[in-house]
């Protein structure tokens, strides 16, 4: 299962950290994507480690652990995040997160 | 300012052991994964080995597995690479260098050290 | 393991000049999770250890004059440097993020009349 903070706020020019965790007594992580709406940030897989995608790459820091570090925010980063585990075996978990970013 | 200072090279024979050591500073070291890449004299790169930050989980050039051990303390911030078994094919400048968090790449690179293997 | 060529493997120019190297990829460097060539270029000046200056096929890393410009996607790369200055003679590598072993090219040796 996948368990994360639903909705998270944080301020204009700061920064916040996206997380979800995952919990399995038998299945292994093989990649975790992390998407703004349709938009990747980045991805981590077991051969390739993390890749932040160029668009985001001044301003996303990959970490804590399978999260993310999202610098710089602006009012326009407000909206949903997801974050998608890919597992073997157990297939796909899916996580939500909604960010609110407030005016400082 | 990153640092990355390797040591431990120096002249051996052939059939016998050595271990680097890489001394990191200026950054979180136990965020990072970290490399050994080498450079025979006057040619090019040859990646060795590396030791992912969280999992430590590791991976070997064909050419050295099962002879070259990778580990690391982050507690001392510190990268190792034993070497046994040592071939004269192993000459080379062995280089630590840094992946960076968001790309799989070398960002940052030790001096180097220098391993001589000759009977 | 994926094999990278270098071409030329050593050119000469003059101060001002316009240079162009190229890397090729016995496999596709493109990586469809993150939509970008897992290609990097790199600068190693005599005596000195390498230095990143290209990731992502075409950007800068940081520090990076803008005279350094990376392109190509697939298999076929290149690296131009266009108003050569003396401090850019050297070796350049290019290397592959798409598979482990992560693998270089044989180097182009940039040499200033």
């Known amino acids: 299962t996948i368990d994360t903070k639903r909705n998270i706020s944080a301020e204009e020019g700061g920064s916040v950290i996206l997380q979800c965790h995952f919990s399995s007594d038998t299945a292994e992580v093989t990649q975790v994507d992390w998407k703004q709406q349709d938009q990747l940030l980045a991805i981590y897989s077991v051969d390739l480690g993390w890749h932040v995608a160029s668009v985001f790459s001044d301003r996303v820091v990959p970490g804590p652990s399978l999260g993310l570090t999202f610098q710089s925010l602006t009012m326009n980063d407000t909206g949903e995040y997801f974050c998608t585990y890919h597992t073997y075996p157990g297939g796909i978990y899916k996580g939500r997160i909604f960010l609110k970013v407030q005016e400082s | 300012e990153v640092q990355l200072v390797e040591s431990g090279g120096g002249l051996t024979q052939p059939g016998k052991s050595l271990k680097l050591s890489c001394e990191a500073s200026?950054?979180?070291?136990?965020?990072?994964?970290m490399h050994w890449v080498r450079q025979s004299p006057g040619k090019g790169l040859e990646w060795v080995a590396f030791?992912?930050?969280?999992?430590?989980?590791?991976f070997y050039a064909d050419a050295v597995r099962g002879r070259f051990t990778i580990s690391r303390d982050n507690a001392k911030n510190l990268l190792f690479l034993q070497m046994n078994d040592l071939k004269s094919e192993d000459t080379a400048m062995y280089y630590c260098?840094?992946?960076?968090?968001?790309?799989?790449?070398?960002?940052?690179w030790g001096q180097g050290t220098l391993v001589t293997v000759s009977s | 393991d994926i094999v990278m060529t270098q071409s030329p493997s050593s050119l000469a120019v003059s101060p001002g000049e316009k240079v162009t190297m190229t890397c090729k990829s016995s496999q596709s460097l493109y990586y469809s999770g993150v939509k970008e060539n897992l290609l990097a270029w790199y600068q190693q000046k005599p005596g000195q250890s390498p230095k990143l200056l290209i990731y992502y096929a075409s950007i800068r890393f940081t520090g990076v004059p803008d005279r350094f410009t990376g392109s190509g996607s697939g298999t076929d790369y290149t690296l131009t440097i266009t108003s050569v200055q003396a401090e850019d003679m050297g070796q350049y590598f290019c290397?592959?993020?798409?598979?482990?072993?992560?693998?270089f090219g044989d180097g182009t040796k940039l040499e200033i009349k």
């Open positions: 290397q592959q993020g798409i598979n482990n072993p992560l693998t």
């Open positions: 030791i992912r930050s969280g999992s430590g989980i590791v």
């Open positions: 260098a840094r992946r960076p968090l968001g790309h799989n790449t070398f960002d940052s």
């Open positions: 200026g950054f979180t070291f136990s965020s990072f994964t």
